[in-house]
């Protein structure tokens, strides 16, 4: 029995199957990449503000730190994916969509083509799909998380797409819009079968999904309101209503937390009451994105992660299943599943 | 404190040029968003264009894309706006505003800029 030496090199757990031996951890403990060592996940507030990208430790009461990353701009939208230890974001002064390891090395480009104003951005960590709203050419796409197999999503009847946020474990994925009639959008991953949730509403930003309740977060830049909803945009609560100007907002465990761009802070407050308020920063600038980076925020199973559904392209995930996907001028055959080139 | 004064308007042909320029008093000038707005006679003041606070980034309404085109110069404390292929319907009373939104599509409403020029007439006619 390999465990029976040095505990098969495993920091806790060792177990030991007929073809190899296997390393996992006690609940609450995650396991590094290299497969053998377990950690208590940190959890830390990540979030943009003009040519930089900052984190701030939950657990540590840590200062805010800028994460040492090279050629940022004008950084908007933020995501990660907890996985292989990523950020994901946009730069509108660059047009480019860029990931790094949290600790600011190999920055690389992975969408830096046909962007315009990108200001919304989601990462798909189940299927490793990166989704984007751009207001500019008022688009959704997607493509894979290193930029492969590029596909328009949603185009028709689309007015200045903002904010994203998924559910793969449901297949939706979930959109505001700015434009003439501001509204919150519910659609399948794969871009089909819109559904429109909630339309008396203003500007809503930095749509955020808690997984564990099943509901939406928004701030509504019209109102100064942070406002709640069931999954279909029913059962509406205001958390919030005396903030002076609420922006990026994000969700973690009991929590809600935001940011507000007339006190310049980071705050924090019970997700379903908004009470018992704590300023965790303040004398920040207009912070245009913020999340809270651990791996309870990327939970959950559906098909996509299990040999990419099979595709050989996109693996894009809906109610009950998943349909594969191709990039933009590719044809999918049906059977085998793979992409044919024009 | 910010304070803004707009230049360059007049009479122009239509299919002709102007530049306006406009001068920013206050040391915090390139930490701030600049913006262009009009106002024609009897209608709202609307959106024409605005540049972030480094230059990266530009935005432009529809009815200006192509033939307007903002810059600014940050050691000059000066935003530019370079108006080509006039028409008699951009004849306005152009205004330049300094936003402390750094960057994004807000920059495209007005409630979002804190300071405002005193604004210069151009008049594009025959």
């Known amino acids: 029995n390999p465990c029976a030496d040095r505990n098969g090199g495993c920091s806790h757990l060792c177990f030991f199957t007929p073809h190899a031996t296997r390393c996992g951890c006690p609940i609450g403990l995650e396991l590094l990449s290299d497969m053998k060592t377990c950690i208590v996940p940190e959890a830390f507030l990540v979030f943009t503000s003009r040519a930089a990208i900052h984190r701030i430790s939950l657990e540590t009461n840590n200062n805010d730190v800028a994460i040492p990353l090279t050629g940022v701009k004008e950084a908007s939208a933020l995501d990660f994916d907890v996985s292989n230890n990523h950020i994901y974001w946009t730069d509108v002064s660059l047009k480019t969509i860029s990931r790094a390891f949290m600790n600011g090395s190999s920055v690389e480009h992975v969408v830096e083509f046909g962007l315009d104003y990108p200001e919304g951005m989601a990462v798909d960590w189940m299927g490793k799909n990166l989704y984007w709203a751009d207001t500019g050419t008022n688009r959704i796409e997607v493509a894979r998380l290193d930029g492969q197999f590029r596909q328009v999503l949603v185009w028709r009847d689309l007015d200045n797409p903002r904010s994203l946020a998924l559910d793969p474990t449901k297949g939706y994925i979930y959109w505001t819009e700015w434009g003439g009639k501001p509204r919150i959008v519910r659609a399948f991953m794969d871009g089909t079968n819109c559904m429109t949730l909630v339309d008396k509403v203003g500007r809503a930003n930095d749509l955020t999904i808690d997984y564990a309740d099943q509901r939406l977060y928004w701030t509504d830049l019209d109102t100064n309101m942070i406002e709640s909803s069931n999954m279909l945009g029913q059962e509406r609560v205001v958390i919030a209503d005396d903030l002076p100007h609420p922006f990026g907002l994000t969700q973690y465990s009991d929590y809600i937390y935001w940011t507000d761009w007339n006190l310049h802070s980071i705050e924090r407050a019970d997700k379903t009451s908004g009470r018992n308020r704590t300023l965790i920063q303040g004398h920040l600038d207009f912070v245009m994105d913020i999340l809270v980076f651990h791996s309870s925020r990327q939970d959950g199973l559906n098909d996509c992660m299990h040999n990419n559904g099979q595709c050989g392209q996109l693996c894009l995930a809906i109610p009950g299943g998943h349909r594969c996907g191709c990039a933009s001028h590719y044809t999918l055959d049906p059977s085998s599943r793979n992409c044919s080139p024009p | 404190e910010v304070q803004l004064v707009e230049s360059g308007g007049g009479l122009v042909q239509p299919g002709g040029s102007l530049r306006l320029s406009c001068a920013a008093s206050?040391?915090?000038?390139?930490?701030?968003?600049m913006g262009w707005f009009r106002q024609a006679p009897g209608k709202e003041r609307e959106f024409v264009a605005a540049?972030?606070?480094?230059?990266?980034?530009?935005y432009y309404a529809d009815s200006v894309k192509g033939r307007f085109t903002i810059s600014r110069d940050n050691s000059k404390n000066t935003v530019y706006l370079q108006m080509n292929s006039l028409r008699p319907e951009d004849t306005a009373v152009y205004y330049c505003?300094?936003?402390?939104?750094?960057?994004?599509?807000?920059?495209?409403?007005?409630?979002?800029?804190?300071?405002w020029g005193q604004g210069t007439l151009v008049t594009v006619s025959s």
């Open positions: 505003a300094a936003s402390p939104i750094p960057y994004g599509s807000l920059l495209r409403r007005r409630n979002n800029y804190d300071y």
């Open positions: 540049i972030s606070w480094s230059g990266g980034s530009t």
């Open positions: 206050g040391r915090t000038f390139s930490s701030y968003a």
